[in-house]
């Protein structure tokens, strides 16, 4: 939010030199008027009258929804996740029909033992959440299951999850190579068939703050951009202060139009200001520039 600039006159001049008589209204903004009942409201840009005031659509605000906000709320998820569809073959358990029934005691016991085994296998992966058996079938026991991974959202979340999926692959390959039957017996919690380990599919949460920002900015999409602060994305226009992309209007007010951000320069009793950034001051009485 911008601080109001104390001025002694009310005229604002655009950087091109024309005087703007109604500074709060962007004359280049398309105007649509909403009429509800017999209340003719000046709700522009798709806004509607709720009986008391204009309810504005993003990215507009103001009494008549005539102004464009400087920042748009974008809310990335707190956590992001990945799901890996894996198949392993357990050789230390013989398949029985009861294992087909997910509500049977046999299935529950197998699920518990398998989960314990996988928790041991993936214990060093901070992103690891757990496993979920989707299907058991003959051979000895072919276990189709999902490995679930989760991490806090950061701009680098995809890299973190990609790295975690690689470690999962390495660890499951290692355990299914090492924990194998010897003389028809298994000394481990579970033994595996080395050749039965397959990664079928990997699904990673898709979240793109730039895309969300552009969508919400609508016709201003080319002028809103994403900047990060404390690993959190902000969808801002150049009129939002405090960011790398912020436009410095010096002696003026930043205003969004459909052609982008521009500075509306102020005129005081003693000076008028001009230039693209309102940084050229001319003293009214002496007519010389202060740079």
């Amino acid at each position: 939010p911008l601080a109001t600039i104390p001025v002694s006159t009310t005229s604002l001049t655009s950087s091109e030199g024309s005087t703007i008589s109604t500074p709060s209204v962007d004359i280049s903004t398309p105007v649509t008027t909403s009429i509800v009942g017999d209340q003719c409201s000046r709700c522009k840009n798709g806004g509607f009258w709720d009986g008391l005031k204009c309810q504005c659509l993003t990215p507009y605000y103001g009494e008549s929804c005539e102004e464009v906000v400087n920042s748009i709320d974008i809310a990335p998820p707190e956590t992001v996740s990945a799901q890996m569809e894996l198949t392993v073959t357990v050789t230390s358990v013989k398949f029985t029909d009861e294992l087909k029934n997910h509500s049977s005691q046999e299935f529950r016991e197998f699920n518990k033992t398998f989960t314990e085994q996988m928790n041991i296998v993936y214990s060093g992966i901070p992103e690891y959440v757990g496993v979920n058996i989707t299907n058991l079938r003959l051979g000895s026991v072919v276990v189709e299951h999902d490995v679930l991974l989760r991490t806090k959202y950061t701009p680098e979340y995809k890299t973190a999850l990609d790295n975690a999926t690689e470690v999962v692959k390495q660890k499951i390959t290692k355990v299914t190579t090492e924990q194998i039957m010897t003389n028809d017996n298994c000394s481990a919690l579970m033994c595996f068939n080395t050749t039965g380990t397959q990664v079928q599919n990997i699904t990673v949460t898709q979240y793109d703050p730039v895309e969300e920002c552009r969508q919400k900015a609508e016709e201003y999409e080319d002028y809103f951009l994403v900047e990060y602060r404390d690993q959190k994305p902000y969808c801002i226009s150049p009129c939002e202060s405090g960011f790398n992309a912020s436009k410095n209007c010096n002696h003026g007010k930043c205003q969004m139009s459909q052609n982008g951000a521009r500075c509306l320069c102020v005129t005081t009793e003693t000076h008028w200001y001009s230039g693209e950034d309102c940084n050229q001051g001319t003293q009214k009485s002496h007519h010389h520039h202060h740079h």
Partner: nanobody
């Protein structure tokens, strides 16, 4: 609720015999796997033998030819016949069970356990 109760332990001289029994209640003895484990003082629990629902058996190398595991499905019972006992067979013997057809003597794979019966082989 599955309950396993062992009996038959005691003091026996080296070279002697003992028969351990395990009565299983709440466990469908015609299914899954039943096993005997033992734990000697100051040592880890080790698998002695297991038997599957179809009668398939497996033994630890140290007891092969001396011990015999069997189960009576009609009586819901598991047995361990121990012959030619040695001092190193001294331990608490545990009965364990799983509803799954297991081929492992890893104790963590068995969810159901008895309280154990003490076997002492000493002259």
């Amino acid at each position: 609720e599955v309950q396993l109760v062992e009996s038959g332990g005691g003091l026996v001289q080296p070279g002697g015999s003992l028969r351990l029994s395990c009565a299983a209640s709440g466990f469908p003895s015609s299914r899954g796997t039943m096993a005997w484990f033992r734990q000697a003082p100051g040592k880890e629990r080790e698998g002695v033998a297991f038997i599957n629902s179809d009668g398939r058996t497996s033994y630890a190398e140290s007891v092969k030819g001396r011990f015999t595991i069997s189960r009576d499905n009609a009586k819901n019972s598991l047995y361990l016949q121990m012959n030619s006992l040695r001092a190193e067979d001294t331990a608490v013997y545990y009965c364990a069970a799983s509803l799954l057809y297991l081929m492992t003597v890893n104790a963590a794979a068995y969810p159901y356990w008895g309280q154990g019966t003490m076997v002492t082989v000493s002259s």
